[in-house]
Interface confidence: medium
Amino acid sequence: QDTPALGKDTVAVSGKWYLKAMTADQEVPEKPDSVTPMILKAQKGGNLEAKITMLTNGQCQNITVVLHKTSEPGKYTAYEGQRVVFIQPSPVRDHYILYCEGELHGRQIRMAKLLGRDPEQSQEALEDFREFSRAKGLNQEILELAQSETCSPGGQ
């Protein structure tokens, strides 16, 4: 049973999500060729497990990250506390924004990701994500990501 403080949050964001777009406050060297749906699974105690596979440079990289709940609703930590992750609903139905800040390879970085329940891109959600990113000072281009149900190395 999830704790009352984060039970609703955790359940609301559980399940299958499509990573629609991402941006950062500095260059991230490569854009994934495609991404599989992200699976967010509620764990005991209110934590979330996030799983996604990215096809980059012909290689499939499986990424599993445990988001540890904090006392603040919608706020989690990851990577042994090196990243703080905020999960907040977008004004557009069935969309969420993941905003994270912390360390990447010894440098501070801030990133935002747009998640949607549907694989089709919502221009309304994308525009809201642009505004959110601008407000946060994330000045890199917004990368729209190709979706794939499975990852095939060496091809899409």
Partner: nanobody
């Protein structure tokens, strides 16, 4: 699944040097980003150094800057960590890893090698 095998650790006196090696299986090693991490007893794993696949950009933890150097040999599928001016606080198990997407470094130990122990005595 990529297999990783670290070597080169040992016992050394403060001020001494070691060179760690890590061999990774796989045909596309040159496309991978590479990095070294370490974990001291009772502490969390921490970033030490990373090397970008293209461009050769290197990044170091503040605690090792100017003392450690990361390099790679794509022909040998090997990444190295040259450690100079070692200090007792560098004592840890050192792990390497390789990954495809710069923005998503490895985050769990299940896919890592056994590591190599470095002990620096004073």
């Amino acid at each position: 699944q990529v297999k990783l095998e670290e070597s080169g650790g040992g016992l050394v006196q403060a001020g001494g040097s070691l060179r760690l090696s890590c061999v990774a299986s796989g045909r596309t090693f040159s496309r991978w980003h590479t990095g070294w991490y370490r974990q001291a007893p009772g502490r969390e794993r921490e970033f030490v150094a990373t090397l970008r696949a293209s461009g050769g950009d290197t990044y170091y933890a503040d605690s090792v800057k100017g003392r450690f150097t990361i390099s790679r040999d794509n022909a040998k599928n090997t990444v190295y960590l040259q450690m100079n001016s070692l200090k007792p606080e560098d004592t840890a198990v050192y792990y390497c890893n390789v990954w495809a997407n710069w923005g998503a470094p490895p985050s769990d130990f299940s896919s890592w090698g056994q590591g190599t122990q470095v002990t620096v005595s004073s």
